[in-house]
């Protein structure tokens, strides 16, 4: 089902999108992800805020927690204990960074319908979770980890050295949260809750980024974050495991780091429990082309964790960095030693491999000039994964099932032909033992979520079909969208073009390039969106194009690793090449071409504007990186190496926006940044502005006081209104 994009006889009742539509979120969609609690039961928060339990087999639903109870503590979230005796209710949500937040937690006892009194949890808590079995609680408060055997029990303190901005236990520091894990937590229960593993991050030697938060006090506050920029001192990480049944008996036991990793700076990248007494840790050298997966076993006699060298598996890249954006995680099979993992095959495409003893002897499960993207679930007889294989469109995602119980394994695409026009980009969520699963389709048509039988793949019911959205769009003139490719010098450039509703190839249109272009990103995806660029095409008659050039993902290592150690070169070249090809198509007004981007996209748009090609009349950079020396070590060094003379300092210096200040003279440039950006620091834009002023180059700028990298809330409305005015002026479009 696709929203009608053809002109019908009632054309006069159809209207274009307005900026107000976009800012009000009028055409936003809903998805439905079941909160699975067994093979055939799931929880869902209803529209009126009741917590409802659904039993798929019987079709019955049960309200297990009323909105009245939720409202009594102003709860915005909940979590049922695995033994179903208690529910935690989360309130006073206070956002910190991308994933992290603090909150107040109340424990509700389902057996007597009352809140647990006595030994209440402290506030605010940084992270809280139930054990996988029963109702033990682990939580992090003031950077220390605590354990409760039952919600009403007094807590057992596991760590004592936690200190704000110095030592983090069970939660990541800034850089691990944003660039490595990436989660708000750094603790992991073993499958039956016998052990609790956690990370300790020592940030004592990390330089601190400090910026003003203006608030409304007489004196601004200073925000201090230990933030390692490229080449700076990094956090020191250690992994510990504690027996939660007798936590005081031997206390936390450290898991040893593989010798080949420990010999220089390194990262911990993830932890996967295999059984209650076997754990798998992944480590990465600071120069991120060598990753080690280490399988460790509990030694009952010594009460320690043993990680034999024979259970170390090395993953190395000779052409780029290890993995895609992150090193992939293993999915273990039922024998608790072999596992499935996605990594590059000999042809340079990311595929699923089965590792039984050594990586060298890995059995390749998928293959082809496409990529396996995620392994969702491995059962006794099936492996479910997503890929972009179908019809050779890299920007699609379909779900596949491989039978692993039979030989040779047979492959079935579960989603390819379900709603072919409407749905080409899926994700999935599986119940225990994959008895049932939900499919969430993101487009290109209106998103829809459905429930399926895990054995037959039969659709059981529609969970969310966005009927209201479909009705609301009936009288809207949406732009047309096409996804195609350009073949240029042995490089395939996929692009998405968003065209005005009455598009006529014989006319000339202003062109706006929207760019992100970061390593391992993908912008050209078959997903539904009614957003700012939809409005620009629908109402303002612009053509908008998104192009996936070198450095982008899911099309093989040749394209992905082309930017290795050379950020800011090929990404920009490929946007320029695409623009030239678009001009050749004959419907672009070459005097009215603009480019805009946010974050990495702001960096690329700035470099494109300063490329000296004369192609762009104007452009916008929102929260851009301006020099890789200003950005986070974990991200930057993955792609650029170190900013040292004997490594890659030269390219760090050559790839700054400031070095091209002179070239902005002949373009209209709008530079935008939030002053409280914890991620891409305001420093980046401050340095661009300084360089432009020093070069006596005119430009426009807007800062957003106390706003972070997301420029949310009222700033969003101001931002898009401001950018709209800028573009309309640039393209000589009347207001």
């Amino acid at each position: 089902l696709r929203p009608s994009r053809v002109h019908n006889s009632e054309e006069n009742t159809m209207r274009a999108l307005t900026l107000k539509d976009i800012l009000n979120g009028t055409f936003s969609y809903k998805t439905f992800f079941p909160n699975w609690i067994s093979g055939q039961e799931y929880l869902h928060q209803s529209a009126d805020n009741n917590i409802v339990l659904y039993n798929i087999e019987t079709g019955q639903s049960y309200t297990i927690l009323s909105n009245r109870t939720m409202k009594s503590v102003n709860a915005s979230n909940y979590g049922l204990s695995p033994d179903r005796q208690f529910v935690y209710l989360e309130s006073d949500y206070s956002k910190l960074w991308r994933y992290s937040y603090t909150a107040t937690y109340y424990i509700y006892d389902l057996s007597n319908g009352e809140f647990v009194r006595g030994n209440e949890l402290p506030r605010p808590i940084q992270y809280l979770c139930w054990s996988p079995v029963g109702s033990k609680l682990a939580y992090v408060y003031q950077n220390n980890i605590y354990l409760k055997q039952r919600p009403g029990d007094p807590p057992f303190q596991i760590t004592f050295n936690g200190r704000e901005n110095k030592i983090f236990n069970g939660i990541p520091d800034w850089v691990y949260e944003e660039e490595m894990l990436p989660t708000k937590y750094a603790l992991w229960w073993s499958p039956n809750g016998k052990f609790l593993a956690y990370a300790e991050f020592n940030d004592k030697d990390i330089p601190v980024i400090a910026y003003s938060y203006y608030g409304d006090e007489q004196y601004p506050r200073t925000i201090n974050i230990p933030y390692p920029k490229a080449g700076a001192k990094n956090p020191v990480v250690r992994i510990f495991i504690i027996d939660t049944t007798y936590p005081a008996y031997v206390g936390p036991q450290e898991v040893p780091v593989p010798a080949m990793i420990a010999s220089s700076d390194y990262y911990f990248s993830w932890l996967t429990w295999v059984t209650d007494e076997r754990v798998c840790l992944q480590w990465l050298k600071r120069v991120q082309n060598v990753s080690v997966l280490s399988i460790c076993d509990f030694r009952e006699d010594w009460q320690t964790w043993d990680c034999p060298k024979t259970q170390e598996h090395i993953e190395e890249s000779r052409t780029g960095w290890a993995g895609g954006f992150f090193v992939s995680r293993p999915v273990f099979s039922y024998d608790a030693i072999s596992y499935y993992k996605i990594f590059s095959d000999k042809d340079g495409y990311k595929h699923i491999h089965y590792i039984k003893d050594t990586v060298e002897n890995a059995i390749q499960i998928t293959s082809g000039k496409w990529e396996a993207i995620n392994i969702f679930r491995v059962t006794q007889d099936s492996l479910f994964y997503s890929s972009n294989e179908f019809e050779e469109y890299p920007g699609r995602r379909n779900i596949y099932r491989i039978s692993i119980g039979s030989y040779p394994p047979s492959k079935k695409c579960v989603t390819c032909h379900l709603r072919k026009e409407r749905c080409q980009y899926y994700t999935a969520s599986f119940s225990d033992y994959a008895k049932y699963y939900a499919l969430v389709c993101y487009g290109p048509g209106i998103p829809i979520s459905t429930l399926h039988d895990g054995r037959t793949d039969q659709e059981i019911k529609i969970l969310e079909e966005n009927k209201e959205l479909e009705n609301a769009l009936k009288n809207i003139q949406l732009p047309k969208e096409e996804i195609k490719k350009l073949e240029v010098d042995e490089i395939t450039l996929w692009y998405k073009m968003i065209l005005p509703p009455q598009f006529d190839r014989s006319k000339k249109y202003p062109l706006l390039i929207q760019v992100y272009g970061g390593p391992c990103s993908q912008s050209v995806r078959s997903v539904f969106a009614v957003n700012w660029i939809s409005y620009l095409a629908s109402k303002e008659g612009m053509v908008i194009a998104l192009v996936d050039g070198r450095g982008t993902a899911f099309q093989g290592d040749k394209l992905l690793y082309a930017v290795y150690r050379k950020l800011g070169v090929y990404e920009v070249e490929d946007q320029i090449t695409a623009v030239r090809k678009f001009i050749e198509m004959g419907f672009i007004d070459e005097k009215r071409i603009a480019i805009w981007g946010w974050s990495y996209g702001g960096y690329v748009s700035s470099l494109a504007l300063a490329s000296g090609t004369g192609l762009f009349k104007c452009g916008i950079a929102v929260a851009p990186v301006s020099s890789w020396e200003y950005y986070a070590s974990v991200y930057t060094e993955r792609f650029m190496g170190l900013p040292t003379k004997d490594d890659n300092l030269e390219h760090y210096k050559n790839s700054t926006v400031m070095a091209r200040a002179e070239y902005f003279r002949n373009v209209d440039y709008l530079l935008i940044h939030g002053t409280a950006d914890d991620n891409v620091h305001f420093q980046n834009s401050a340095q661009i502005a300084k360089a432009l002023v020093n070069a006596q180059v005119d430009f426009q700028a807007m800062w957003y006081s106390d706003q972070n990298h997301g420029l949310s809330g009222l700033s969003t409305n101001h931002l898009y209104t401001h950018m709209t005015h800028f573009l309309k002026q640039c393209f000589s479009l009347s207001d």
Partner: nanobody
């Protein structure tokens, strides 16, 4: 170990009421969660209502507001008051027990069962 015996079923007209009882043997009745399930011909056995050892109850949305579950720990009995009965309520009604939480809706999670009592609602 707990033994369960249901009673109170019968034939009733649509809109009518019945009170089902379930007598349990054993001194530890008060520590068990109790539930009422029903099974119509050719259909899955489904949980209708359950009550925890602490007295907290919940219901299938299809019977909410019409059925009431209660327990009398002194009499080792759990009740299901069924009002405004509909023809689709026709089924064999089973009493079930489990240790721990009442908030399980799969029959497999309830180890102890009665023999069942027939409820027939005529239109």
């Amino acid at each position: 170990q707990v033994q369960l015996q249901e009673s109170g079923g019968g034939l009733v007209q649509a809109g009518g009421s019945l009170r089902l009882s379930c007598a349990a043997s054993g001194r530890t009745f008060s520590t068990y969660a109790m539930g009422w399930f029903r099974q119509a011909p050719g259909k899955e056995r489904e949980l209708v209502a359950a009550i925890s050892n602490g007295g907290s109850a919940y219901y299938a949305d299809s019977v909410k507001g019409r059925f009431t579950i209660s327990r009398d720990n002194a009499r080792n009995t759990v009740y299901l008051q069924t009002n405004s009965l509909k023809p689709e309520d026709t089924a064999v009604y089973y009493c079930a027990a489990r240790r721990g939480s009442a908030y399980y809706t799969n029959r497999i999670d309830w180890p102890y069962w009665g023999q069942g009592t027939q409820v027939t609602v005529s239109s």
